[in-house]
């Protein structure tokens, strides 16, 4: 059965931010695991895409993700399928909007002494908490004849009267951020005497080096006064301008204009207008410079013909917010048709191979503009160009089997050998087209081939049979040299194969015939009773029609096996004394003799003054130390055969007599008598 | 078959708030590549597209509109809402609702419209 | 915005006529056109989307061409029931634009 170890859970997420629904499946065969959004799959893009089998969001967006998501887990063996628990996101977001006039209906008919009622249509969730500003100080409820709801997100002032008049503007808070109004509401209650709003400024974005221009205006009887102070309240008028504002002209309409705007001149202007009566109106207007960052790089990305697929392009940071567009062969993306744009998405509809190419994304805002190229590949399924066909081998020589495919992108190719892969190794090798090389063939390689070729869009495969020619050959050759052991029965065994099979048989190789003693059976040379006669040269021959024949020679020796008539024993020996390790082996030929020490071969022309083999085979160790100490190994060997003894030496500390020991007492162990050797 | 119809008030006084529903039938707007647009004529002048609104909520304004224009749908009741605030004589004009399909054209079907007049 | 200048504003034609109308962009659009048919009285119609695909049921005496700025829609043919006013669209960017229609006229 299918088991969800880890299920998705409902929780918070922030707009824009990341997220993750986490999923986990433990299962007895494979299982695919995909995800439903309210019942329906959820499509990768790059915003939401299946991280294994887990939901990664790269940013949550409060309309495409709101509903219910479920992970489902099926087995496509047995179609059973599992649906973990409902999880769903409670995205925490926030949107500005403007202050609207609520009451009355129409700023027409806003008369001192009437109530008035503003809305901020600030929106978001959790729903956020509200601030009201009157030309841009904070308003707190209950003071100077005005109420906020802010259940309703409602400013109402009652009555109404001249100081109530100003730019009204909103801004709201919550867990999720903050937001001001986009549009603020100038309310203007006729006090003549009183400044009153005509023209607020709005905060500006320019490149660097252009021109920007505030407008602000009021209005009283007699004409208020007008004043633009910058960051530190230094005051801008066309007779003192302060250092970093050379380029600052003041119009007799108000306006204040930057030319050759630099980063220094960014920050907050503040224009002023003070009537004869009523307090000051301070309105507040902030210029930014704008910018635009770079755009990361795309990954070239490998699509179906047939398939829906979309590449989302997130604009770079910037500001104004950069906009964003598709182009492909130098022409725009549509709104609509089977490739389109939609938001910053590039959609590609039941993609055809024509899509193929590079779609390059546009961002672009006052600062400037910037792009960035993704490449499409629109993979195609393998066709034929050749097939691997049914082939005779020759045995030993290089195979070839062909697999020669097409298709976009360039297909893959693997080869199989009895519903095995072939893995390459020294004697497979598959080239760049899909041809498999068998570098040299052999007799068990007569068997099926299957290849497969593959693209993203699909594979194609087809098999073939592999016959392998045998060449006629010694199976195994027989040994060039060869003892037999004297006055004993010996055989000597010749077997060949070939397309045919062979007929194997044996003859002197001076021509002469082999005598009664000795047999050819079907390739096996019998001697009942090897003579001294019987050395000698001997060729096998094998033959057959097709192929002819091929031949062995053997040289046969006649020797008598080797024996040891004397072999080492365990011996232990004081520290000092000398050790004898004697040997002596026969045979014919004579053998020679070798030792061997401690894991190593004794070189005679480099033992050193303390170790000597004599001409019988018998070694003699001087001077023993406790280092000399192992095991000793006498090896007999002629050019028939190698026979070897072995025996331990012990090297041992001479005991310190003791008072009850006579002066014959025997040692605790045998000990071979030996001679001190005495140092000059 | 696909059909559309407009309702909403045929005289607004200025200053007033336009409300236009487009009933439809013989799609869904749960549809993937499913849209809704609105488009007025004034009486004998071009087209002029407003809005539209996708399956999946994605909103396109008319920018010389937009600070005026609210679109909005209910799926549920097969339903797309239009509101145009601070109407004025010039907005006289006979308002159009039309499908799109994503994939293949804007406006494929249109209802056969409703003339709003706006006056005092 | 894209502006879509038509022409002719209007013109008069007899039936077997063949009538072409033309439609300038003021950008590259691509061929993110559709060409629209307008009776007395009635709704807009879909003719012809992308430039050039006839749309389902139409018939086949009206075609479509053209790409980048320069589309033109033509009535091969013309038959008393194409008396209308023709417009185009663009949908190559938002805000979509239309032309300012062409009245067709049948002598």
């Known amino acids: 059965a299918i088991v969800f170890i880890k299920q998705p859970s409902s929780q918070d997420a922030l707009q824009g931010r990341r997220a993750l629904l986490r999923c986990e499946v433990e299962a007895p065969g494979p299982v695919h695991v995909y995800w439903l959004l309210d019942g329906a799959p959820v499509q990768d893009t790059e915003r939401r895409f299946a991280q294994g089998s887990s939901l990664s969001f790269a940013a949550v967006d409060r309309l495409q993700d709101s509903g219910t998501f479920q992970c489902v887990a099926r087995d496509d063996v047995t179609g059973e399928e599992a649906r973990s628990a409902n999880a769903s996101f409670n995205i925490k977001w926030i949107e500005a909007g403007p202050v609207v006039l609520k009451h009355p209906a129409s700023e027409a008919e806003i008369q001192p002494q009437t109530q008035v009622t503003l809305r901020c249509h600030i929106d978001g969730h959790p729903r956020p908490t509200y601030q009201w500003f009157r030309d841009g100080t904070p308003l707190s409820d209950g003071q100077s004849n005005h109420t906020v709801s802010s259940k309703e997100r409602n400013l109402t002032l009652r009555p109404a009267g001249p100081e109530h008049s100003g730019l009204y503007s909103c801004c709201a808070h919550s867990a999720f951020g903050q937001a001001c109004s986009s549009q603020n509401f100038t309310l203007s209650i006729a006090d003549e005497s009183f400044a009153r709003v005509v023209l607020a400024p709005q905060d500006v974005v320019v490149a660097r080096y252009e021109e920007a221009m505030f407008h602000c205006q009021f209005s009283a009887q007699p004409p208020p006064s007008l004043q633009w102070l910058f960051e530190d309240e230094t005051p801008i008028t066309n007779r003192s301008r302060p250092p970093h504002l050379r380029r600052a002209t003041v119009f007799a309409n108000g306006s204040l204009l930057l030319t050759q705007v630099r980063p220094r001149n960014a920050g907050i202007y503040r224009c002023i207008g003070q009537g004869q009566r009523g307090p000051p109106i301070i309105l507040e207007a902030t210029l930014h410079l704008a910018e635009i960052e770079d755009m990361p790089l795309f990954e070239p990305r490998v699509f179906t013909a047939g398939s829906e697929e979309r590449v989302t392009c997130l604009p770079p940071k910037g500001l104004p917010e950069p906009s964003v567009w598709w182009e492909h062969a130098g022409v725009r993306l549509p709104t609509h048709g089977r490739v389109y744009q939609k938001g910053h998405e590039l959609v590609l509809a039941n993609i055809a191979e024509s899509d193929a190419g590079v779609y390059t994304c546009h961002a672009a805002n006052l600062a400037g503009q910037r792009r960035q190229d993704v490449n499409i590949t629109v993979a195609t399924v393998p066709s034929w160009l050749k097939k691997p066909q049914d082939s005779q081998l020759e045995e030993g020589k290089p195979g070839y089997l062909d697999c020669l495919t097409q298709a976009t992108p360039k297909p893959t190719v693997v080869w199989y050998r009895n519903q095995m892969l072939i893995s390459e190794d020294s004697r497979f090798e598959v080239f760049k087209n899909g041809t498999l090389r068998i570098n040299s063939v052999e007799v068990y390689d007569g068997t099926w081939y299957r290849c497969m070729s593959s693209t993203p869009a699909g594979s194609i495969e087809a098999q073939a049979r592999v016959q392998v020619l045998e060449k006629l050959k010694f199976t195994p050759p027989p040994q060039p040299q060869q003892c037999m052991e004297f006055d004993k029965e010996a055989t000597v065994p010749c077997s060949a194969t070939g397309r045919e099979k062979p007929t194997i048989k044996w003859e002197r190789a001076d021509g002469s015939s082999l005598p009664e003693w000795v047999t050819d059976n079907a390739g096996t040379l019998h001697f009942a009773r090897v003579t001294r006669d019987d050395a000698g040269n001997y060729t096998c021959i094998a033959s057959n029609g097709p192929q002819g024949q091929i031949r062995a020679h053997v040289q046969l020796t006649v020797a008598v096996f080797i024996t040891f008539k004397v072999e080492p024993e365990r011996t232990t020996v004081y520290q000092g004394h000398t050790a004898l390790l004697q040997c002596e082996a026969q045979g014919d030929p004579k053998p020679l003799i070798q030792w061997k020490g401690k894991d190593r071969i004794l070189d005679p022309t480099k033992l050193g003054p303390r170790m000597h083999i004599f001409q019988n085979g018998s070694l003699v160790i001087h001077d023993v130390a406790p280092e000399d100490s192992g095991r000793y190994t006498c090896i007999a060997g002629n050019s028939c055969n190698i026979k070897h003894t072995e025996a331990p030496l012990y090297v041992v500390d001479k005991p310190v007599p003791e008072e009850s020991e006579g002066p014959g007492s025997p040692p605790p162990y045998k000990m071979i008598q030996t001679h001190h050797h005495h140092h000059h | 078959q696909v059909t559309l119809k407009e309702s909403g008030p045929t005289l607004v006084k200025p200053t007033q708030t336009l409300t236009l529903t487009c009933t439809f039938s013989g799609f869904s707007l749960s549809t993937s590549g499913m849209g809704i647009n609105w488009i007025r004529q004034p009486p004998g002048k071009a087209l002029e597209w407003l809005a539209l609104i996708w399956w999946d909520d994605d909103k396109y304004y008319n920018p010389s509109l937009k600070n005026r224009l609210t679109i909005t749908k209910d799926t549920s009741k097969n339903q797309v809402v239009l509101t145009m605030t601070n109407m004025d004589p010039v907005d006289t004009a006979t308002y159009y609702c039309a499908r799109s399909l994503i994939t293949t054209a804007p406006s494929d079907y249109w209802g056969q419209g409703t003339l709003v007049t706006v006056s005092s | 915005d894209i502006q879509m200048t038509q022409s002719p504003s209007s013109l008069s034609a007899s039936v077997g006529d063949r009538v072409t109308i033309t439609c300038k962009a003021s950008q590259n659009v691509g061929t993110a056109i559709t060409w629209y048919q307008q009776r007395p009285g009635k709704a807009p119609k879909l003719l012809i989307y992308?430039?050039?695909n006839r749309y389902t049921g139409v018939p086949s005496r009206f075609s479509g061409s053209g790409s980048g700025t320069d589309f033109t829609l033509t009535i091969s043919n013309l038959q008393p029931e194409d008396l209308a006013t023709y417009f185009c669209l663009q949908y190559s960017d938002y805000p979509l634009t239309f032309g300012q229609g062409t009245r067709l006229e049948i002598k």
């Open positions: 992308s430039a050039s």
